[in-house]
């Protein structure tokens, strides 16, 4: 479960920029485009519009370079650098035959068997809830335990530092094995088991990770869009968790939607379970005071709380997690290749 290197990506933006820098024309065009890219939080320092003739010309020159189709990876080293390059080039997409709603992340799907040692779970009561069991499985794994303790420490205390808490949460969901991270957060609880539901809701330390006073959802999104990482994770979520129909079909795949959902944890747009008695998730924000943007705000809110693709993806994963413990395991160590394409 090591971090992917640039070389493992089909076309990483960092690699693509290196190639571009070896070509004088490409290098000059990229540097010019870099000055054209507006920061979403501040105006262009040069005052040059991103759609000015010179910027359009620079964009046109990059159309034939590998930069135009470059991607980043959620678990790569130097992810911030890669995303900065992606967003420098991204405005080019609006100038030609390219989709505007493409996730900056490449889907390199690695289907690994999920090996877990259940022998030590015998120290738990047989009727212990599954959230407790998945928490124990994390504790029994050195890497998962270390990463979980790191965010537990950063997110605890009366006066926790929220930015550090969020950074450690991101680190956990980026670096822990996907099976452990998903097991910990998407553990199934019996409807009447409020203790289990509360444990699940507290997994991401919401008292520290989420703002104490709920901000307006559109303000939260604007804040998110001003940050390349948060903007990337939000676009990833919008790409993969868009519902195609009322059945809950996802625009790409359930597994990719879940990956995108988990990728938002630790950003400004951190979602969480809203109650201990069901599996509804929501952003920690409100649409009060949205004025004439009320509809837009509610749509953003519903893309989490009433999204049939996301709801079905979470339900399917919880069903899978329940199945893991519903059989009589002859062997305490088992290996599962998940049906859902490594989700």
């Amino acid at each position: 479960n090591s971090l992917p290197t640039e070389n493992r990506l089909v076309n990483s933006c960092t690699q693509a920029r290196k190639k571009c820098e070896a070509n004088p024309a490409c290098k000059a065009a990229y540097q010019h485009l870099d000055s054209c890219t507006p920061s979403l939080s501040s105006p262009l320092p040069s005052g040059e519009s991103a759609t000015s003739a010179a910027c359009l010309e620079a964009a046109q020159q990059l159309r034939n370079s590998s930069l135009i189709d470059c991607r980043c990876h959620r678990r790569m080293k130097h992810q911030a650098t890669c995303l900065d390059i992606y967003w420098t080039v991204h405005p080019v997409r609006s100038l030609g035959d390219y989709e505007l709603d493409v996730s900056p992340y490449e889907d390199t799907v690695t289907s690994k068997p999920w090996k877990m040692n259940l022998s030590k779970l015998s120290m738990l009561k047989p009727d212990s809830d599954l959230c407790l069991k998945f928490a124990m499985l994390c504790t029994l794994n050195d890497k998962c335990d270390r990463l979980r303790k790191a965010y537990g420490e950063a997110c605890s205390g009366i006066r926790c530092q929220r930015h550090l808490c969020l950074a450690q949460l991101r680190s956990f969901f980026e670096k822990a094995a996907e099976s452990h991270a998903q097991g910990l957060l998407l553990c199934p609880c019996a409807p009447e088991d409020a203790g289990c539901g509360e444990r699940r809701r507290n997994t991401i330390a919401p008292s520290c990770a989420l703002p104490s006073v709920a901000p307006n959802c559109l303000d939260l999104r604007s804040f998110c869009r001003a940050d390349p990482l948060c903007r990337s994770r939000l676009m990833d979520f919008q790409t993969h968790c868009h519902p195609m129909d009322i059945l809950g079909t996802c625009a790409t795949e359930q597994s990719r939607c879940l990956r995108a959902y988990l990728g938002l944890i630790g950003t400004a747009m951190t979602p969480n379970f809203i109650s201990k008695v069901n599996t509804t998730v929501a952003l920690g924000c409100t649409c009060r005071g949205s004025g004439n943007l009320q509809d837009e705000c509610e749509q953003l809110e519903k893309s989490f709380s009433q999204n049939p693709c996301l709801m079905e993806a979470i339900a399917a994963k919880m069903r899978f997690h329940r199945q893991l413990f519903s059989q009589d395991w002859a062997d305490s160590t088992f290996s599962v290749m998940q049906q859902q394409n490594s989700s």
Epitope: I246, L247, N341
Partner: antibody, heavy 115, light 108 residues
Framework: QVQLVESGGGLVQPGGSLRLSCAAS????????MHWVRQAPGKGLEWVSV????????YYADSVKGRFTISRDNSKNTLYLQMNSLRAEDTAVYYC????????WGQGTLVTVSS | DIVLTQSPATLSLSPGERATLSCRAS???????LAWYQQKPGQAPRLLIY???NRATGVPARFSGSGSGTDFTLTISSLEPEDFATYYC?????????FGQGTKVEIK
């Protein structure tokens, strides 16, 4: 490569039956909702049926309800459409489709209902 | 059932012109579940737009979708020779899912 291939079409008499198959390859079939869509000669598209990724939910157009049955075998990566009590108005090219952001359609199989 | 009515039935335009196709629903449709397809003679349909305004994979930027409630629009900003085809809207918001009757975009 990623593709859907329909088979099982042909000429059948009114009142007869046919079973269409759609073989999927190049993607994880069990992850996707699947559809059947048909098109009568010279006419527009008509949605026929849909089945959820695990087969637990199925829905039909009013025109085929009670006569057609959609099913899937995820172990064989195959989608089926069992068509009974066929009528002349069922004559069409039948497409199976994966309707997501990167959609896939089969090449279609022609079903002709005629005496 | 939700009935989708497309207009016009036929649109005669020249390459380079702008095409505006309309799709009207008999009742409100959640824009998440409104799609547009392109079909050329002898070929299977191809998804162009999903969620009323999102381009499907590989679809050129000259295609755009908009609208909400009962009125939806597909716009082709500047027609290319390969864009002359029949276009269908589809709703997947209520069962049975339904298609519009289609708009044929032909060369003038």
């Amino acid at each position: 490569q990623v593709q859907l291939v329909e088979s099982g079409g042909g000429l059948v008499q009114p009142g007869g039956s046919l079973r269409l198959s759609c073989a999927a390859s190049g993607f994880t079939f069990s992850n996707y909702t699947m559809h059947w869509v048909r098109q009568a000669p010279g006419k527009g598209l008509e949605w026929v049926s849909v089945i959820s990724y695990d087969g637990s939910s199925t829905y039909y157009a009013d025109s085929v309800k009670g006569r057609f049955t959609i099913s899937r075998d995820n172990s064989k990566n195959t989608l089926y459409l069992q068509m009974n009590s066929l009528r002349a108005e069922d004559t069409a090219v039948y497409y199976c489709a994966r309707i997501v952001r990167m959609d896939i359609w089969g090449q279609g199989t022609l079903v002709t209902v005629s005496s | 059932d939700i009935v989708l009515t497309q207009s016009p039935a036929t649109l005669s335009l020249s390459p380079g012109e702008r095409a505006t196709l309309s799709c009207r629903a008999s009742q409100s449709v959640n824009s998440h579940y409104l799609a547009w397809y392109q079909q050329k003679p002898g070929q299977a349909p191809r998804l162009l737009i999903y969620g009323a305004s999102n381009r499907a994979t590989g679809v050129p930027a000259r295609f755009s979708g908009s609208g909400s409630g009962t009125d939806f629009t597909l716009t082709i900003s500047s027609l290319e020779p390969e864009d002359f085809a029949t276009y269908y809207c589809q709703q997947m918001d209520g069962f049975p899912f339904t298609f519009g009757q289609g708009t044929k975009v032909e060369i003038k």
